[in-house]
């Protein structure tokens, strides 16, 4: 699965929430960022995430699509120089400071389950998705023969129109 260009084809600033409308928030604690899944107080502003969209080619062994076998991959950055990354050993999702080019662990295949819900599949571990477990983000293995619609891997993106990365 190779990224076909080093720069994103588009970017958007969005808030990220679970299928059950809990917010994904990011907090700086002891010089590292923690990720929380929580009900937001009404007056609290939602945290923003910069989504960068990249085109990716299916491995030719996997698909007969040839030039058309493209997927959208995203990276998610809630604050400058930090990106969500898959830790496949620990089955966890972590925020790490990185320089470009970003490691493969920072890329997720975008799945539109419905028009307004998305899932994020780990580039480094196909079949493993960002999901919600015990009020935290985790990596969750999904059996493709089962329904990909399990709510704990579904997220909503609410795009924010003025695009300034903090």
């Amino acid at each position: 699965m190779s990224i076909t260009g080093i720069s994103p084809i588009t970017e958007s600033l969005a808030s990220l929430s679970t299928y059950n409308d809990q917010s994904i928030t990011f907090a700086l604690e002891d010089e590292s960022y923690e990720i929380y899944v929580e009900d937001l107080k009404k007056d609290k502003k939602k945290d923003k995430v910069l989504l960068s969209y990249y085109e990716s080619q299916h491995p030719s062994s996997e698909s007969g699509d040839g030039v058309d076998g493209k997927m959208l991959m995203v990276t998610l950055s809630p604050t400058k120089d930090f990106w969500l990354q898959a830790n496949n050993k620990e089955h966890s999702v972590e925020l790490h400071k990185s320089e470009k080019p970003l490691p493969d662990q920072a890329f997720f295949v975008l799945h539109n389950r419905s028009f307004n819900s998305v899932s994020f599949e780990s580039k480094t571990d196909p079949g493993v998705f960002i999901g919600v477990k015990d009020n935290h983000l985790a990596l969750i293995k999904v059996d493709y023969s089962e329904n990909l619609g399990s709510e704990n891997i579904l997220f909503k993106l609410s795009e924010i129109h003025h695009h300034h990365h903090h």
Epitope: E55, G64, D65, D68, K70, M71, H111, N112, R113, N147
Partner: antibody, heavy 121, light 106 residues
Framework: EVQLVETGGGLVQPGRSLKLSCVAS????????MYWIRQAPGMGLEWVSS????????YYLDSVKGRFTISRNNAENTVYLQMNSLRSEDTATYYC??????????????WGQGTLVTVSS | DIQMTQSPSVLSASVGDRVTLSCKAS??????LDWCQQKVGEAPKLLIY???NLQTGIPSRFSGSGSGTDYTLTISSLQPEDVATYFC????????FGGGTKLELK
């Protein structure tokens, strides 16, 4: 090579039904959202319906809701549009299109040649 | 629902001209916009996706730009084979086409 072949169009009386089929080849069908778009004679394009890659989510133009049903058979690489209670304003060429990206509802990259549906008494 | 308005509805230009087609959305569509070309008697063909990305096999004289609600398709040097109707199309919220711009030769 990507190919989409629509069939099932024809002349039908108002109030009757018609089922369109679109057979796909040249790509991994089950990975892609599929769409129906129509074009009335001499007019512009109008999105009609969408279905996600596993068939679990479907979307419709307001004017066809409750009358049209989109479905797919991933084993047979086919997407369908069942059209009931047809009206004269449904007269159009109906195109089938595939999503631009695997798993994604963003954009569509290939279109079939279309099948003409004429609703007239 | 998002409405897409294309202008002009008909455009006459000469071979070699730089041609600009406009598409305006009723709400911000976050660059979720494509352009397609339809020649008489043919199915539409994708030219540009996500506002400014050229579809494989499309000549580089075609380019797209824009953001928010305002988008543009530019043909840097019009060729006879570019005579067609051009449609913009948004997929930010539902799926909606513009009314089209018919491009003809002077």
């Amino acid at each position: 090579e990507v190919q989409l072949v629509e069939t099932g169009g024809g002349l039908v009386q108002p109030g009757r039904s018609l089922k369109l089929s679109c057979v796909a080849s040249g790509f991994t069908f089950s990975n892609y959202w599929m769409y129906w778009i129509r074009q009335a004679p001499g007019m512009g394009l109008e999105w009609v319906s969408s279905i996600n890659n596993d068939g679990g989510n479907t979307y419709y133009l307001d004017s066809v809701k409750g009358r049209f049903t989109i479905s797919r058979n991933n084993a047979e690489n086919t997407v369908y549009l069942q059209m009931n209670s047809l009206r004269s304003e449904d007269t159009a060429t109906y195109y089938c299109a595939k999503g631009h990206y695997s798993y994604s509802s963003y954009s569509f990259s290939y279109w079939g040649q279309g099948t003409l549906v004429t609703v007239s008494s | 629902d998002i409405q897409m308005t294309q202008s002009p509805s008909v455009l006459s230009a000469s071979v070699g001209d730089r041609v600009t087609l406009s598409c305006k959305a009723s709400h911000n569509i976050n660059k979720h916009l494509d352009w397609c070309q339809q020649k008489v008697g043919e199915a539409p063909k994708l030219l540009i996706y996500f506002t400014n990305n050229l579809q494989t096999g499309i000549p580089s004289r075609f380019s797209g730009s824009g953001s928010g609600t305002d988008y543009t398709l530019t043909i840097s040097s019009l060729q006879p084979e570019d005579v067609a109707t051009y449609f913009c199309f948004q997929y930010n919220s539902g799926w909606t086409f513009g009314g089209g711009t018919k491009l003809e030769l002077k």
